[in-house]
């Protein structure tokens, strides 16, 4: 069966939107009015993995681009990257683990935990226009909580 996907945008708990500022550069900043059109639309695919009531494995692709968020160990540190894939083969139900995030819902907020690196989360900085990254701490300076807005396909 084909993998089930939905289109959405994400904003962090400070209401910063995610935008592409270059081919491999995902940054978080406040947008208003017409500029909201700049925000990235994700194709969130529901993939194979450990699942529970509040934890759902997903892959986050960029709509109409052959790019996925992935988590790799780079110089001994879990690192978030935008990775090019062959569009003929993606998305698929059984995604490689580096592409899988556990979407965790807590108090109407979402966290995206790396399946490859437990307790590492998609994070944004407090500062404006900084890259989205993989962070190993929750509840500190960096932001790990997001809200999701559905986008019609």
């Amino acid at each position: 069966a084909p993998v089930r996907s939905l289109n959405c945008t994400l904003r962090d708990s400070q209401q910063k939107s995610l935008v592409m500022s270059g081919p491999y550069e995902l940054k978080a900043l406040h947008l208003q009015g017409q500029d909201m059109e700049q925000q990235v639309v994700f194709s969130m695919s529901f993939v194979q993995g450990e699942e529970s009531n509040d934890k759902i494995p997903v892959a986050l692709g960029l709509k109409e681009k052959n790019l996925y968020l992935s988590c790799v160990l780079k110089d001994d540190k879990p690192t978030l990257q935008l990775e090019s894939v062959d569009p003929k083969n993606y998305p698929k139900k059984k995604m490689e683990k580096r592409f899988v995030f556990n979407k965790i819902e807590i108090n109407n907020k979402l966290e995206f935990e790396s399946a490859q690196f437990p307790n590492w989360y998609i994070s944004t900085s407090q500062a404006e226009n900084m890259p989205v990254f993989l962070g190993g701490t929750k509840g500190g300076q960096d932001i790990t909580d997001f809200t999701m807005q559905f986008v019609s396909s």
């Epitope: 592409m20 500022s21 270059g22 081919p23 491999y24 550069e25 992935s70 790799v72 780079k74 110089d75 540190k77 690192t79 978030l80 990257q81 935008l82 990775e83 090019s84 900084m130 890259p131 990254f133």
Partner: antibody
Framework: EVQLVESGGGLVQPGGSLRLSCAAS????????MSWVRQAPGKGPEWVSG????????GYADSVKGRFTISRDNAKNTLYLQMNSLKPEDTAVYYC?????????WGQGTQVTVSS | QAVVTQEPSLSVSPGGTVTLTCGLS?????????PGWFQQTPGQAPRTLIY???NRHSGVPSRFSGSISGNKAALTITGAQPEDEADYYC????????????FGGGTHLTVL
Amino acid sequence: EVQLVESGGGLVQPGGSLRLSCAASGFTFSTYAMSWVRQAPGKGPEWVSGINTGGGSTGYADSVKGRFTISRDNAKNTLYLQMNSLKPEDTAVYYCAKDWMATTPWGQGTQVTVSS
Amino acid sequence: QAVVTQEPSLSVSPGGTVTLTCGLSSGSVTTNNYPGWFQQTPGQAPRTLIYNTNNRHSGVPSRFSGSISGNKAALTITGAQPEDEADYYCALYMSSGSNNAVFGGGTHLTVL
């Protein structure tokens, strides 16, 4: 303040190799894509190569594809360019730059001269 | 490989407005090309003016603005100053599988 310091250039014979390094400071290196750009004497800049944060996606100008390899060491805040099978037309000042599209104050670069 | 085209030279009077363009030999420029604009004066390294179509780099005067107009990227200088006399280069990301970026040949701007 963003600082990028290139090194490793020099005079090399055609067919030879060089490895350029770029030491980065003043920003969180591991969260940015990086690139190399070069400029030959009297010519405009030429984008050479780019690499994403984790090193899993790279890109190369057609003129260097198969001869140059970009890499990075996030623990050392350093970007590299391994240049093999060098040609006289690779002679240029080589700059490293923050972001894939080189959106940064550029450093002073390192001179590479390929000549017999 | 696609060629990035720019006007070889343009001139503007001090205080005047001038628009430099950046096109593709095949097809239209879109935001997916992440157009960037760079300024270079003799003996200096290039300096980033605009990235990602219309974002001014820090410290760049507000008289410089970027846009996409028709099928090209554009750099507009409103109220040109003598110190704006320089070479201007654009760069475009080639998203059609080649995964690289290409600079244009540059425009020499004279302010007289």
